[in-house]
């Protein structure tokens, strides 16, 4: 659920880290209504996810570690 590059809601799916190539953070105080993580998938889709959810935090942690180790 995204409009003019802003997420308006969150996916109700759980995505696997092997399906994700990267992410962007959306902050509510920077012109969008809600905080969100925008996952970029191997199918070239952008998926809006709830940054408070367990699986979302796990993937963000995983990808952040990868970037640090590069």
């Amino acid at each position: 659920a995204s409009n003019f590059d802003c997420c308006l809601g969150y996916t109700d799916r759980i995505l696997h880290p092997k399906f994700i190539v990267g992410f962007t953070r959306q902050l509510a105080n920077e012109g969008c209504d809600i905080n969100a993580i925008i996952f970029h998938t191997k199918k070239k889709l952008s998926v809006c996810a709830n940054p408070k959810q367990t699986w979302v935090k796990y993937i963000v942690r995983l990808l952040s570690k990868k970037v640090k180790n590069m």
Epitope: R13, K18, W55
Partner: antibody, heavy 121, light 107 residues
């Protein structure tokens, strides 16, 4: 050690509702999603849905939307699944399972003992 | 939804033999595949996760392989204790889906 203790067997009438419980112990309940799986001789194992106890966010298999409702109570580390408008098709063993995260993988690493639901008049 | 096709549906082998169960996905699942063992009257148990990783406490006689759409589970030096139904599971994206199961019997 991790344990998922499920409620006892249920015999229910067609059209009725039933709520199954799953009490977690041995780990931090809010750190992992709880998933529910249906087992029948005909369809084998079917994923019903999951709940994140921290946020109460849910994910459902479209097939079970309107049939199952997942909830969780942080204070008692218990997950619940309500099944409504029961028919003989809902007769099955239902499992709660903890979701494992690690080495960039997801899996159901601990399972409850299962709750048998029989729908019969 | 991603469909998982498991074969064979049942199989009978002798103690000491090596058997292979295969699982095909309707699309690429990038190794997001698990295997479970369900013994009669018991809850399923995680056997292999991430296509190739052996779960804690499971025998090293079990091994998983595959990528893309095709995966397999190999059981070497079959034991009577291996009698069970084995399921593959796609976890790429919900709804997570299971294969139909393979019932393993000992001759």
């Amino acid at each position: 050690q991790v344990q998922l203790q499920q409620s006892g067997a249920e015999l229910v009438r067609p059209g009725a509702s039933v709520t199954l419980s799953c009490k977690a112990s041995g780990y931090t309940f809010t750190d992992y999603e709880m998933h529910w799986v249906k087992q029948t001789p005909v369809h084998g194992l079917e994923w019903i849905g999951a709940i994140d106890p921290e946020t109460t966010s849910t994910a459902y298999n479209q097939k079970f939307k309107g049939k199952a409702t997942l909830t969780a109570d942080k204070s008692s580390s218990t997950a619940y699944m309500e099944l409504r408008s029961l028919t003989s098709e809902d007769s099955a063993v239902y499992y709660c399972t903890k979701c494992y995260y690690g080495s960039a993988d997801y899996a159901m690493d601990y399972w409850g003992q299962g709750t048998s639901v029989t729908v019969s008049s | 939804d991603i469909q998982m096709t498991q074969s064979p549906a049942s199989l009978s082998a002798s103690v000491g033999e090596t058997v292979t169960i295969t699982c095909g996905a309707s699309e690429n699942i990038y190794g997001a595949l698990n295997w479970y063992q369900r013994k009669q009257g018991k809850s399923p148990q995680l056997l292999i996760y991430g296509a190739t990783n052996l779960a804690d406490g499971m025998s090293s006689r079990f091994s998983g392989s595959g990528s893309g759409r095709q995966y397999s589970l190999k059981i070497s030096s079959l034991h009577p204790d291996d009698v069970a139904t084995y399921y593959c599971q796609n976890v790429l994206s919900t709804p997570w889906t299971f294969g139909g199961g393979t019932k393993l019997e000992i001759k």
